[in-house]
Structure formats: C-alpha cells, structure tokens
C-alpha cells in the first residue's frame, strides 16, 4: 500500500467509559487512522486534540467546532442515560462500557462503516442502517437497551450521518493531508542479544528490530538460506515516535547456534536485506 | 457562497394548493439535509418538515400539524427543494423559510436561510 | 413534543446594558439548544448552537449558558444593532420547537 497502512485502512473513534460506581464515573476517548492514533478527547476543556500536524484533514474549523460540540454533548448524554437506566438494565457496578465506531477503505473506496458497543468487555449491541440492533447472544438486556437508544430518531440521524457521510469524508481527506507523514519510509535497526534460558545445554536467541515504518516487515531466523520454522515472532509494537518494534526468537541446542543468522526484510531496505550473524555478535542483554 | 432563494408563494384559497420551490447553490445539495421552517405574520417559528440528504436515502420527516397535507420533496438534478402543500387553512398562512444546517451534520443548527416566501390563505 | 418557553416576552433596554433572555424546556435537552436573533422582514440567523457555542462570526458579547431544561442568551453589552427578536431552539428530538421569541426593544 502506497500510504504505508495495510488495506483495509479505517478511521475508527473509541470511547472507553468505566462507571466505578453511581457518581463516579471515568472516560477515555480517542481517534484512530488504522493503528495509528490521530486524536485524543480532553475532557476537562472538551475539546478535540490534534496529535499530528495533519490530525485536521481538510475539515474547516467550523465543522471541528461542530464536532467538538456534538462529541461533548454526546458524552454527557451517554454518561447521564447509562447511568439512569444502569438498574433496570441490570448493570452492576463496576462496570465498563466500550464503544468503537468509523469507517473502512478497499482501494481507495469506502466500503462501510460500523458502530458497536460491548458490556463488560462483550458484544452487546451494534448500529446498523439506522438504528439500534441487540447481538443475539447478549440477551433481554441488551433488546431493552436497543428500545432506550431507538427512542430518539434525531440522535440515529446524526449517528447514521457521522457514518455514512462524515466518516468517509473525513478520512479521504486525512489520508490526503497525512500523505507525506504516511508514505515515507524508516529503515529499521537491528540486534541480538540472548533471551533468558529455556534449559540446560540450550540458549534462546533474540533478535531485535527497531525503529521502521511501515509495519509490515519480515523477520527470521536462518541457517544458510533455510528459513529456521521454530522462529516465534513477537507482537509487533508501537514506539513513541510512530515507528514499529519487533523480536524474534529461536530456542536451539548450544552447539547449533554458531551459523545462525537473523535476517530483516522491509520495504524502506529496498531488497537489501539485514543479516545479522549470531556468532559476530558480542554479549549483551 | 450558500445561497438558498425560495418562491411560489402567494394567495391561495382555504383547500387549495400550492407548491413551493427553494433554489439550492454554492454547496453540495446531496450532502446536506434540507428544511422548510415558517412564521405566521407577527408571530414566532415554527418547523415544518426536513428531507434527508443522500446518507439518509432522502426520506423526510414532518410537524404533526402538516402530516397528511404538506409533502417535502426534492430534485437533486436542479438543486431544488419542494413543499408541496395541499388542504390548505387560514393557519398555514405565514413566511415560508428554506433552511440548512451550518455542515453536512444533521444537528438541528440552522445557519443558513433563504429570504422567505409568503404564502396567504384567505377566501 | 418538548415545549419551549421564553422569557420576558419582551424587554427594553439601553445600549451598553447587559441583557438576560430565558428558555425553559419541558425536559432535559441536553444542551441541543439554539438561538437566533431576528429582524423585522429579514430570516433569523444563528448565533449560539450547542448550549454555549458561538456561531463563527457572531460577536462575543453573545453568550449562551444551561443545562438540562435551563438555558440562558446573554448579551454582555448592547448594542444599536442588537434590538431584535430572539428565539430559542432545541433540536433533541422531532419535531424541533422553537420559543415564541423575545423582543427586545431600545428604552
């Protein structure tokens, strides 16, 4: 993908709400290119917070103060009608409710968008066309909580729109702004180092790769040109910069590990591959 | 620059008809929720009904006091919105406002406005 | 449907006074509340959405505070332009209601 972000790419905001107790109550709020966060929520000034220089898209600061606007009503209401109804729904406190909603991109196309909330950490009911559906296996509970949220057809219209048309628009309009930030390409670093051990007469080795952009990346260990299978790869994680970190790991008897090497791919090594020889490398870690 | 100019206002007689029409330009008109809103002479606003944009699959909604007699409508192809209102009454004369929200949201906001047509029911 | 009362109906004031103009909603509208201020033979025009938020362009001796069913236009210090109608408006649920209006008028 030219823009650096595997297809599908999406927008998505999520709001985490914890309800510790009947007037206690805590919110975290942010928004998401992909895996790639663009925004935060402050709730003390209710405003939207720009983490990227191209966080705005090509929205006007009008349509931002509007949904500035709208998420802070929004977030009070959720917090307000949740709590109201948090009895009869049979919510126990503590409890947690999650939502996620945005919108996808295939090829540059919007292919839809999507907004679900889950209780406790499971599915519970999700926005579909215009309104509010119950998932099956969340019961009587969430039937009633659906009835609550479809009782005002002027809230699905400006959900349904945020979806449907203010969603696709933005996000066309954020790839476009991010465009430089999102293409360029950031070599990684890489190292190895032992892992602790996993038994007598065996070593677990460890090789480190920092520091790239894109995400995608390739990392293996190899003996000669064969691919080692037993290689356990990592999450790959974020790192404050916007970069990418992974590690790779190989358990192997003592005395195999001398022609063993560690090899990187990544699109920035423009086919020049990273290979690291684990009996070049000096002991650390 | 939105521009909004509304017409087809005039004298009519009680039970008869009229349709008016509210010229759209300067913005994209499948983007945006349209709304028909009045004032009676001398007297405060009130909404009439609102057709949904392309998202909404431009269905409408309408005041209970006009259901059943007044239907919104629009041409997406000439960027125009229609009312057209039928069994007319001495109370629905008034100034026929078209209206839009400030963006593509549906809020309720209205920060755009047409000049107004009046329409006059008497015999 | 949600009823929206206005009050005073009418109101005369002075330049440079601080005026106060009050809606109250039959219930909780969550800050979905809007004003406009009116002039005779001309379309309203939006001056606070949101409860509290000023329109682009509108001076910032308009001021829009509430919550719940309480709302409140003030207009910190009048101005000779500023005599006019005022309506509130709410847009929480179908159908939208409108005040019937404040007149505020020169003393």
């Known amino acids: 993908n030219a823009d650096g972000l595997k297809e599908p790419l999406s927008f998505h905001v999520t709001w985490i709400a914890s309800f510790y107790n009947h007037s206690w109550k805590q919110n975290l709020v942010s928004g998401w290119l992909s895996d790639l966060q663009t925004h935060t929520w402050d709730s003390n000034s209710s405003t939207i917070v720009f983490l990227c220089p191209w966080s705005r898209g090509n929205f006007s600061n009008e349509e931002w103060k509007e949904l500035e606007t709208l998420f802070r009503i929004r977030t009070i209401r959720s917090f307000e009608g949740i709590r109201r109804y948090a009895h009869e729904l049979q919510f126990e406190y503590p409890f947690e409710i999650q939502v996620t909603g945005g919108c996808e991109l295939h090829s540059g196309k919007v292919s839809g968008s999507f907004l679900q909330l889950a209780y406790q950490g499971s599915d519970f009911v999700s926005f579909q066309n215009n309104s509010w559906l119950p998932y099956p296996v969340a019961g009587n509970m969430a039937k009633h909580f659906c009835k609550v949220l479809n009782q005002n057809q002027h809230e699905n219209d400006i959900t349904h729109n945020l979806l449907s048309d203010t969603c696709p628009r933005f996000i066309l309009g954020l790839l476009d702004a991010g465009k430089a930030h999102l293409q360029r390409q950031v070599k990684p670093e890489a190292w190895l180092s032992h892992g602790p051990s996993p038994g007598p007469g065996h070593l677990q080795l460890v090789c480190h790769v920092s520091g790239f952009y894109p995400k995608p990346v390739w990392v293996m260990w190899m003996r000669g040109e064969q691919e080692q299978q037993g290689t356990q790869r990592g999450d790959i994680l974020p790192s404050a910069d916007g970069t990418w970190y992974l590690r790779a790991t190989l358990e192997v008897a003592a005395g195999e590990a001398a022609d063993l090497s560690c090899r990187v791919k990544h699109s920035s090594l423009e086919g020049q591959d990273i290979v690291l020889y684990w009996e070049h490398h000096s002991s650390v870690g | 620059e939105v521009q909004l100019v509304e017409s087809g206002g005039g004298l009519v007689q009680p039970g008869g008809s009229l349709r008016l029409s509210c010229a759209a330009s300067g913005f994209t008109f499948t983007d945006h929720y349209m709304t028909w809103v009045r004032q009676a002479p001398g007297k405060g606003l009130e909404w009439v009904a609102f057709i949904r944009n392309k998202a909404g699959g431009y269905t409408t909604e309408s005041n209970p006091a006009v259901k059943g007699r007044f239907t919104i409508s629009r041409d997406n192809a000439k960027n125009s919105l229609y009312l057209q209102m039928n069994s007319l009454r001495a109370e629905d004369t008034a100034v026929y406002y078209c209206?839009?929200?400030?963006?593509?949201?549906?809020?309720?906001?209205?920060?755009?406005w047409g000049q107004g047509t009046l329409v006059t029911v008497s015999s | 449907d949600i009823q929206m009362t206005q009050s005073p109906s009418s109101l005369s004031a002075s330049v440079g006074d601080r005026v106060t103009i009050t809606c109250l909603a039959s219930e909780d509208i969550y800050f979905d509340l809007a004003w406009y201020q009116q002039k005779p033979g001309k379309a309203p025009k939006l001056l606070i959405y949101?409860?509290?938020r000023l329109k682009e362009g509108v001076p910032s001796r308009f001021s829009g505070s509430g919550s719940g069913t309480d709302y409140t236009l003030t207009i910190s210090s009048l101005q000779p332009e500023d005599f006019a109608t005022y309506y509130c408006?709410?847009?929480?649920?179908?159908?939208?209601?409108f005040g019937q209006g404040t007149k505020l008028e020169i003393k």
């Open positions: 408006q709410q847009s929480y649920s179908y159908p939208y209601t």
């Open positions: 949101g409860g509290d």
């Open positions: 209206a839009r929200e400030t963006t593509g949201i549906p809020t309720g906001w209205f920060a755009y």
